[in-house]
């Protein structure tokens, strides 16, 4: 008796976020015996779309020619072989932007910041918003994910950073979003520059130090609680 | 569950050096930054040190600045504090603290005596 | 650095009764401020970030507010597994620094 099928792997070109009347791409690669693939959008009916796979039989392509609220949620393929269906993919998130009036990004007490102190981002939206979304550009885990308390209506979100170091230089947006559906946003706010001067820092290499990139870790305002990345997309601080 | 073991601590006479480590465990060690905090017996907290997840950033307190090393190794899940020039006045407990980002530090180890007499 | 003033240094209440300590610092921080607390012989352990975000598995009696320069950490009900020495920390600017903590009895 063999084992179940593995899982095929899931994602979408260009990204997973994508702009109101974008086209994006959903690709689910299975293996070569894959005779059929099948697309599954939570909370839609099953299947959401089904494909022949292109040669060599390996993957299958699902088009959607121009990104609408329709589209926004989450997704999982499975392919069918010979000997029966896969197991699903990991989950893949599309999120559209565009949905709401785009909110406003600062950085108190102001984005000129000195290594090894604190600053905060304030993301605020004209309109009562649930969740607000911080992304900078090139880091590994783009999006951290404030939900306010108690499903209380808001027109900001902070996001502290304490302490500041060099990777946490660079060019941040925020989104807002209602709670009802969190794959979609709001258009993006302006992008906010953060400079960070000067050093508190020990000037002396050490060791064990390596060269730290623009995508590591540290690039993340780290929240005490729930920090762990939630299926690959946000950081929660609730 | 967030678990952080130091060891190392001791007697030792002034001028001596020890080496502190910290063994991390429950969470993603190399995502997050990371601190030595000092007590000395029946005081207060002192900051001793921090570390960036990825090492590329380390702040010392000036009492310790020349004196003290802090490094980790991400693929070890370990922490440590390398303390050279020891003095009568470093005689502490020292704990390894989790950092959060925000300024706090959410987890803590149970702590490690040291003991700098002649 | 950045200096803290805790008052006040020790205290003495019944059980049930609401407690108040007060942190001082010597510039703005902002929200930047943190409360623990630390039992005999124990590690300290974080009760509230940022002011007053409560931390995980924190029992609701526990609450802090202010901002800028002047903070409040309150127990709204005493309970006797409360018994522990409170310390207040900036996290705005490293080096991060303590108040001298507040030792709390029960009378």
């Known amino acids: 008796q063999a084992g179940p099928l593995p899982k095929p792997t899931l994602w979408a070109e260009p990204g997973s976020v994508i702009s109101w009347g974008n086209s994006v791409t959903i690709w689910c690669q299975g293996t070569l015996e894959a005779r059929e693939y099948r697309l599954d959008k939570e909370e839609s009916p099953a299947p959401w779309d089904r494909q022949n796979p292109l040669e060599p039989k390996n993957k299958a392509r699902f088009s959607i020619p121009s990104m609408t609220e329709d589209y926004a949620g989450r997704y999982r393929c499975y392919y069918r072989s010979p000997v029966g269906w896969s197991q699903p993919s990991d989950p893949l998130e599309l999120v559209m932007t565009g949905a709401y009036s785009k909110p406003t990004l600062s950085a108190l007490p102001s984005p000129l910041v000195t290594s090894g102190k604190s600053v905060t981002l304030l993301c605020q939206s004209r309109s009562p918003m649930d969740t607000f979304l911080l992304i900078k550009e090139r880091a590994a885990h783009p999006l951290l994910h404030l939900r306010s308390e108690h499903g209380a209506q808001q027109h900001q979100a902070e996001f502290p950073m304490s302490p500041v170091t060099s990777v946490h230089g660079g060019t941040y947006r925020c989104f807002s979003s209602h709670g009802f559906s969190h794959y979609l946003l709001s258009h993006p706010s302006d992008p906010l520059e953060l400079i960070v001067s000067g050093s508190l820092e020990d000037p002396r290499p050490s060791p064990t130090r390596s060269v730290s990139t623009a995508a590591g870790p540290e690039d993340q305002p780290l929240m005490p609680t729930g920090s762990v990345p939630h299926s690959g997309l946000r950081r929660h601080w609730e | 569950e967030v678990q952080l073991v130091e060891s190392g601590g001791g007697l030792v006479q002034p001028g001596g050096s020890l080496r502190l480590s910290c063994a991390a465990s429950?969470?993603?060690?190399?995502?997050?930054?990371m601190h030595w905090v000092r007590q000395a017996p029946g005081k207060g907290l002192e900051w001793v040190a921090y570390?960036?997840?990825?090492?590329?950033?380390?702040y010392y307190a000036d009492t310790v600045k020349g004196r003290f090393t802090i490094s980790r190794d991400n693929a070890k899940n370990s922490l440590y504090l390398q303390m050279n020039s020891l003095r009568a006045e470093d005689t502490a407990v020292y704990y390894c603290?989790?950092?959060?980002?925000?300024?706090?530090?959410?987890?803590w180890g149970q702590g490690t005596l040291v003991t700098v007499s002649s | 650095d950045i200096q803290m003033t805790q008052s006040p240094s020790s205290l003495s209440a019944s059980v049930g009764d609401r407690v108040t300590i007060t942190c001082r610092t010597s510039q703005d921080i902002s929200n930047y401020l943190n409360w623990y607390q630390q039992k005999p012989g124990k590690a300290p352990k974080l009760l509230i970030y940022y002011t007053s975000k409560l931390h995980s598995g924190v029992p609701s009696r526990f609450s802090g507010s202010g901002s800028g320069t002047d903070f409040t950490f309150t127990i709204s009900s005493l309970q006797p597994e409360d018994i522990a020495t409170y310390f207040c920390?900036?996290?705005?600017?490293?080096?991060?620094?303590f108040g001298g903590g507040t030792k709390l009895e029960i009378k």
């Open positions: 603290a989790r950092g959060t980002g925000t300024g706090a530090m959410d987890y």
């Open positions: 429950g969470f993603t060690f190399s995502s997050f930054g």
């Open positions: 570390i960036s997840s990825g090492s590329s950033s380390i």
């Open positions: 920390q900036q996290g705005n600017t490293l080096p991060w620094t």
